[in-house]
Structures are given as structure tokens and as C-alpha cells.
């Protein structure tokens, strides 16, 4: 089983938006949800 880390560095690239993974609760943005570390 893959373990999920909030700082995994996962990026979402679609519709010309890029959400860079940061720690949950960071001051970088709001948690998008249902992904790994995505904030915006």
C-alpha cells in the first residue's frame, strides 16, 4: 500500500492550473481535497 504524505511533491497539471504540494495547514493556500498535498 502506498502511504500518503502531505509533502509528497505531487503536482496537478491540467486546465493550465498548477497546484504545488505543500504541508497541510501551511500558509500557502487552501487544501483542494482528494489528492496528495494539493493546495491553492
Amino acid at each position: 500500500d502506498a502511504e500518503f504524505r502531505h509533502d509528497s511533491g505531487y503536482e496537478v497539471h491540467h486546465q493550465k492550473l498548477v497546484f504545488f504540494a505543500e504541508d497541510v495547514g501551511s500558509n500557502k493556500g487552501a487544501i483542494i481535497g482528494l489528492m496528495v498535498g494539493g493546495v491553492v
Epitope: A2, H6, A30, G33
Partner: antibody
């Protein structure tokens, strides 16, 4: 406790616009994006998009071709979804929702109670 | 856009028996060994509730009789021993790419 409370039912004529609100409480408003999902009567679920209360950035389902606008008011912890150029096929229950990211041990979802929007001449 | 297809459309199962729902994605919903596939339960007049995330992980407070399996494009939700309170419509959803998309739903009833 986390709560998402939506505005009441609306009846609109074709071509009009509707603005549905979703008031968040029980957590820090700016830490979670708010998504909108709709469900036509007797039909399935359709994701419309989300907005970030932190940045104001939104991402919309292109199916709605510029008809949808999602905004937020941080002073009242409220997110709004406006849908314009309404047609009968837009008759649906509109839900706002908040989701955790994938994490070890927990993922929670929270949903508003739903707002029925009826489009009829 | 990723298209999610569920089968069957409806399912009648006896109390205590197993219920199996299938979901197929038009392309892989995997990324870096994680399947971005979620399952929801919706009862009449209520919003959906997250049951399973990342294909196999149980949501908070979800009974152990609900389990998920699969990867890539093919996924399954299993209710190991159907209870009366499990009567609902079940949806799969992908969160790999925007726009997020849902399957058409599977209605589970008591036989």
C-alpha cells in the same frame, strides 16, 4: 463541528441567473477549498468546480462554458456559486462540499444540505 | 475528460449477502502508485457520503463491511454482508484530473 449551510430553494425563469450561498463554520474558512456538485432530479452527480477561500482562485468544469462563477467572502466565511443563462436542464439540487486531502489514517468530507434550483417558465 | 462507467445500474441482494459494484475509467486514474478513485454512498434526500478513497482506504467512520479494490482503470466496491441501512445509490468518482467525474451510480436494494 464543521458545518456548511446553504441558502434556500430558488425558482428561476429560463435565461435568468441564480446565486447560491454556502456558509462555512467550525473550522478556519481559508484552509479548505469549497467544491460544488449538482444533481438533477433522479440523476447522478456532476462536479461543477471549486474555489479557494484562501486565494480566490477557482477551477470550473468547462461544460459550463463561462456560465458559472464561484466567489468567496472571507468576512462572512461564505462561498457563492452563480450560474447564468439558466435553462430547464439546470434544474437540480446544488451541493457545496469540503474534502480532506489523502492522508494516512483519515479523510473526511462535509456537505451542505443542498439547494434546489428550479428553472421553469 | 475522464469518463467513469459503473455496472450494474441496479442490484438486488439478500440481507447478509455480498454486493459487488464495478467502476471503469476511460483512462488510468493512477499516479505515482496511488489510485485517485473514490466511492460515495447516497441515501434518498441526503447528500453523498464518502465511503472509500484512494481505491482501498476507508473513510472516517465507515463500517468494515465496505471495501474497495482495483487500480488503473478497473475498480470494485464490495459490501461483504448487506444490511438494511445499506440501501442507497453508490457512485465512483475520479479525482486524478479536473474536471472531476462521477460514474452514473448503482442502486442497491434488498432482494
Amino acid at each position: 463541528q464543521v458545518q456548511l449551510v446553504q441558502s434556500g430553494a430558488e425558482v428561476k425563469k429560463p435565461g435568468a441567473s441564480v446565486k447560491v450561498s454556502c456558509k462555512a463554520s467550525g473550522y478556519t474558512f481559508t484552509t479548505y477549498a469549497i467544491h460544488w456538485v449538482r444533481q438533477a432530479p433522479g440523476q447522478g452527480l456532476e462536479w461543477m468546480g471549486f474555489t479557494s477561500p484562501y486565494s480566490g482562485v477557482s477551477n470550473y468544469n468547462q461544460k459550463f462554458k463561462g456560465r458559472v462563477t464561484m466567489t468567496r467572502d472571507t468576512s462572512t466565511s461564505t462561498v457563492y456559486m452563480e450560474l447564468s443563462s439558466l435553462r430547464s436542464e439546470d434544474t437540480a439540487v446544488y451541493y457545496c462540499a469540503r474534502f480532506d486531502n489523502y492522508a494516512r489514517g483519515y479523510v473526511r468530507d462535509y456537505w451542505g444540505q443542498g439547494t434546489l434550483v428550479t428553472v421553469s417558465s | 475528460d475522464i469518463v467513469m462507467t459503473q455496472s450494474p445500474d441496479s442490484l438486488a441482494v439478500s440481507l447478509g449477502e455480498r454486493a459487488t459494484i464495478n467502476c471503469r475509467a476511460s483512462e488510468s486514474v493512477d499516479n505515482d502508485r496511488i489510485s485517485f478513485l473514490n466511492w460515495y454512498q447516497q441515501k434518498p434526500g441526503q447528500p453523498p457520503k464518502l465511503l472509500i478513497y484512494a481505491a482501498t482506504k476507508q473513510g472516517t467512520g465507515v463500517p468494515d463491511r465496505f471495501s474497495g479494490s482495483g487500480s488503473g482503470t478497473d475498480f470494485t466496491l464490495t459490501i461483504s454482508s448487506l444490511q438494511a441501512e445499506d440501501v442507497a445509490v453508490y457512485y465512483c468518482q475520479q479525482s486524478k484530473e479536473f474536471p472531476w467525474s462521477f460514474g452514473g451510480g448503482t442502486k442497491v436494494e434488498i432482494k
